[in-house]
């Protein structure tokens, strides 16, 4: 009795859904009473399916309402674990153990990343030095480095601060600032680079606005 996996590594985005599956041999009709399916992650029990019933009492609380065994897939010889709203804590090595006449188990790794997609930006002017301060802030995982460039393909020196945005989500809060003497309409780019997944790089475009001129009759002295 041997079980197989089509993938032993799943890489998914934070907040998305994932279905990991282990395949086992089924000849014609599936005998549910003879089937045992366990899904575990490290020391956490996720699924305990015995004699056609799922025992939710043993399920670790972190998977409550989020993890389920897709019962209809069992008849196709697939023990499919679906996890919804994936968190960073869900990353790790999963083990599917199946008993059906014989017994076998396989390991599957789940990696979770959170792209720095939503970049907040701000442009301000230092009234003393007339320097512009450009700021880009975003949340993601794992940590990202931020590079600043201009439209002439030059890399500029910004200052980046990384903190944990929320102890619950474990996402990183990355804030980068660039102080520069510049003029209206110049374009700058802040790019959040994730070495682990280059396709997850995100960029914001910052255009220096025209200076805000206060009409002479509205100026305060």
């Amino acid at each position: 009795f041997t079980i197989t996996v089509s993938k032993d590594l799943y890489v998914v985005e934070y907040g998305s859904n994932v279905t990991m599956e282990c395949r086992f041999p089924v000849e014609e009709q599936l005998d549910l009473v003879s089937l045992i399916v366990y899904w575990e992650m490290e020391d956490k029990k996720i699924i305990q399916f015995v004699q056609g019933k799922e025992d939710l009492k043993v399920q670790h609380r972190s998977y409550s309402q989020r993890a389920q065994l897709l019962k209809d897939q069992l008849f196709l010889g697939k023990a499919a674990l679906q996890i919804t709203n994936v968190t960073l804590e869900d990353a790790g090595v999963y083990c599917c153990l199946i008993g059906y006449g014989g017994a076998d188990y396989k390991r599957i790794t789940l990696k979770v990343h959170a792209p720095y997609r939503k970049i907040n930006q701000r442009i301000s002017v230092d009234p003393v030095t007339s320097e512009h301060e450009l700021m880009c802030q975003a949340e993601g995982y794992p940590t990202a480095e931020v590079i600043w460039t201009n439209s002439a393909h030059q890399v500029l020196n910004g200052k980046t601060i990384i903190s944990v945005s929320n102890m619950e989500t474990k996402l990183f809060n990355v804030t980068s600032t660039l102080r520069i003497n510049t003029t209206a309409n110049e374009i700058f780019y802040c790019t959040f680079l994730q070495r682990s997944s280059p396709e997850g790089n995100s960029t914001a475009e910052l255009v220096i606005p025209e200076p805000f001129l206060v009409p002479a009759n509205e100026r305060t002295h």
């Epitope: 201009n150 002439a152 960029t203 475009e205």
Partner: antibody
Framework: EVKLVESGGGLVKPGGSLKLSCAAS????????MSWVRQTPEKRLEWVAS????????YYPDSVKGRFTISRDNAKNNLYLQMSSLRSEDTALYYC??????????????WGAGTTVTVSS | DIVLTQSPASLAVSLGQRATISCRAS??????????MNWYQQKPGQPPKLLIY???NLESGIPARFSGSGSRTDFTLTINPVEADDVATYYC?????????FGGGTKLEIK
């Protein structure tokens, strides 16, 4: 149609000056960094100068620094290269080239047909 | 300055066959998770035309017969299959650091 048309080339004596122009059309000129690239008679390509979209930042290789000045007029959609203290090794076909738009798109994606500069006594 | 050495200086390939052009950089052109190597095609009497950027990305409108590969210091432009219209000189160019430099070119001819 995206188009770059260079003009202003010609024959000039060593030590002389010349100003090249490049007329851009078919794209939002003021959003792009621009460059000049030259091709020597031996067909070697050399980057000459770059300028940011707003004209604030300019960059040059050491071979032309202090002698060449790149500038632009976004209202007229024109790019310029002022060349002075010209040397025989500046003889080349000068191309106006658009820089790739966005972060990390570091390439020349549109080229003009070029204008020839000959430095000879 | 980063020196780019292209090889061969010229090559003749039969129609329908594969052409491989190499470009070696005197130092790495990799940074920020990218390889900043570009490839251009120049036909006689015409300006250079961008084919491949960041080592392996095909420029819009360029046929899939053209492909690029490599990282750090060693890069390759492959044309497969070669067509009559591909007769040109091909240049590699690094944009990882100033001054931006070009290779000496490889002239492709049909056998």
């Amino acid at each position: 149609e995206v188009k770059l048309v260079e003009s202003g080339g010609g024959l000039v004596k060593p030590g002389g000056s010349l100003k090249l122009s490049c007329a851009a059309s078919g794209f939002t000129f003021s959003s792009y960094g621009m460059s000049w690239v030259r091709q020597t008679p031996e067909k070697r390509l050399e980057w000459v100068a770059s300028i940011s979209n707003g004209g604030t930042y300019t960059y040059y290789p050491d071979s032309v620094k202090g002698r060449f000045t790149i500038s632009r007029d976004n209202a007229k959609n024109n790019l310029y290269l002022q060349m002075s203290s010209l040397r025989s090794e500046d003889t080349a076909l000068y191309y106006c080239a658009r820089l790739g738009y966005g972060s990390l798109n570091w390439y020349f994606d549109v080229w003009g047909a070029g204008t020839t500069v000959t430095v000879s006594s | 300055d980063i020196v780019l050495t292209q090889s061969p200086a010229s090559l003749a390939v039969s129609l329908g066959q594969r052409a491989t052009i190499s470009c070696r950089a005197s130092e790495s052109v990799d940074s920020y998770g990218n390889s900043f190597m570009n490839w251009y095609q120049q036909k006689p009497g015409q300006p250079p035309k961008l084919l491949i950027y960041r080592a392996s990305n095909l420029e819009s409108g360029i046929p899939a017969r053209f492909s690029g590969s490599g990282s750090r210091t060693d890069f390759t432009l492959t044309i497969n299959p070669v067509e009559a219209d591909d007769v040109a000189t091909y240049y590699c160019q690094q944009s990882n650091e100033d001054p931006r430099t070009f290779g000496g070119g490889t002239k492709l001819e049909i056998k």
